[in-house]
Amino acid sequence: SEVEYRAEVGQNAYLPCFYTPAAPGNLVPVCWGKGACPVFECGNVVLRTDERDVNYWTSRYWLNGDFRKGDVSLTIENVTLADSGIYCCRIQIPGIMNDEKFNLKLVIKPAKVTPAPTRQRDFTAAFPRMLTTRGHGPAETQTLGSLPDINLTQISTLANELRDSRLANDLRDSGATIRIG
């Protein structure tokens, strides 16, 4: 089953995915796609990196983290209800059937219409602990259990700025993380 993340219409959605490069600058190709991970690569690719840089992207989809350090979390800008669905993060580790696949489910909720006097917005995300397994079936990600939902109402940074907060750093070890080498 896919891990679930939530955002509101008009917000930026954040889908976490990390790996630890074997050495600084020793990057692994990564793709993000709309739809569950297929056998090879990603279906309906929205963003792709190679060993050096982001080499393909589509509008509204970007990597806000430091992908050179393995933070390949996807930010989707100004989401609409149509952005709901499953997204695939695939870390293409060289070797024989070494790819790591993560299916993340994005749920978009209608925007709250209550007036807000401040510029702060709500962002609630569940950061699950992930166990990755090497296997030959489609389900190579198993959820061990989610941490409690974390309400970031008090934090003025938006979801796409989470990586800069100490909280996000604490959560990094709980997300979809792969160590290479």
Partner: antibody, heavy 123, light 107 residues
Framework: EVQLVESGGGLVKPGGSLRLSCAAS????????MTWVRQAPGKGLEWVAS????????YYLDSLKSRFTISRDNAKNSLYLQMNSLRAEDTAVYYC????????????????WGQGTLVTVSS | DIQMTQSPSSLSASVGDRVTITCRAS??????LTWYQQKPGKSPKLLIY???TLAEGVPSRFSGSGSGTQFTLTISSLQPEDFATYYC?????????FGQGTKLEIK
């Protein structure tokens, strides 16, 4: 015009080895995943192995990965399948196929196929 | 492994007939399904990918539908050149697997 031409098939004794080749032309070979699919006489299609653009990632039918090795030489526009410890059940026509690809798609289906090369394993 | 089961295994029809071939997956494969056509002594030809997208150069009388575990290939009006064997293939789970084929013969 896209062309895939397999070679290297033939008659081999059980336990023997063969190396199949696939010469590609008419497209930028290094932009595509490549795949081997086989078809035993009178039977259906069976996926054998696939390889990514630069050869760093390979994928195999589990029962074959200890005996078969897929590789590619992008400088020569060539795909290879090294087959060791061959068995009678490996007898088949072996097809080389190109994974359909553009930047926004995944190469999980095959838009061009070679004519196939017959491998017969028999004593 | 994901099993792909096609029905019928063989089918007799006439030119002009509407024909439907079914492919069932043993588990959810979303829309990750491809259809190929193969004529005797020839290599397979890509017809439809992602369950319903027509490959380049394929006549519009071919169509695909379905998602999850149930898929269909429909030929709206059979032409003489359509008599062949048809295979479905899933590309969701490793290994890639094909259906056993449906042989379409002239009645």
């Amino acid at each position: 015009e896209v062309q895939l031409v397999e070679s290297g098939g033939g008659l081999v004794k059980p336990g023997g080895s063969l190396r199949l080749s696939c010469a590609a032309s008419g497209f930028t070979f290094s932009d595509y995943y490549m795949t081997w699919v086989r078809q035993a006489p009178g039977k259906g299609l069976e996926w054998v192995a696939s390889i990514n653009y630069d050869g760093r990632n390979t994928y195999y039918l589990d029962s074959l990965k200890s005996r078969f090795t897929i590789s590619r030489d992008n400088a020569k526009n060539s795909l290879y399948l090294q087959m060791n410890s061959l068995r009678a059940e490996d007898t088949a026509v072996y097809y080389c196929a190109r994974g359909y690809y553009y930047y926004g798609s995944s190469p999980n289906y095959f838009d061009y196929w070679g004519q196939g090369t017959l491998v017969t394993v028999s004593s | 492994d994901i099993q792909m089961t096609q029905s019928p295994s063989s089918l007799s029809a006439s030119v002009g007939d509407r024909v439907t071939i079914t492919c069932r997956a043993s588990e959810n494969i979303y829309s990750y399904l491809t259809w190929y056509q193969q004529k005797p002594g020839k290599s397979p030809k890509l017809l439809i990918y992602n369950a319903k997208t027509l490959a380049e150069g394929v006549p519009s009388r071919f169509s695909g539908s379905g998602s999850g575990t149930q898929f269909t290939l429909t030929i709206s009006s059979l032409q003489p050149e359509d008599f062949a064997t048809y295979y479905c293939q899933q590309h969701y789970g490793t290994p890639l697997t094909f259906g056993q084929g449906t042989k379409l013969e002239i009645k």
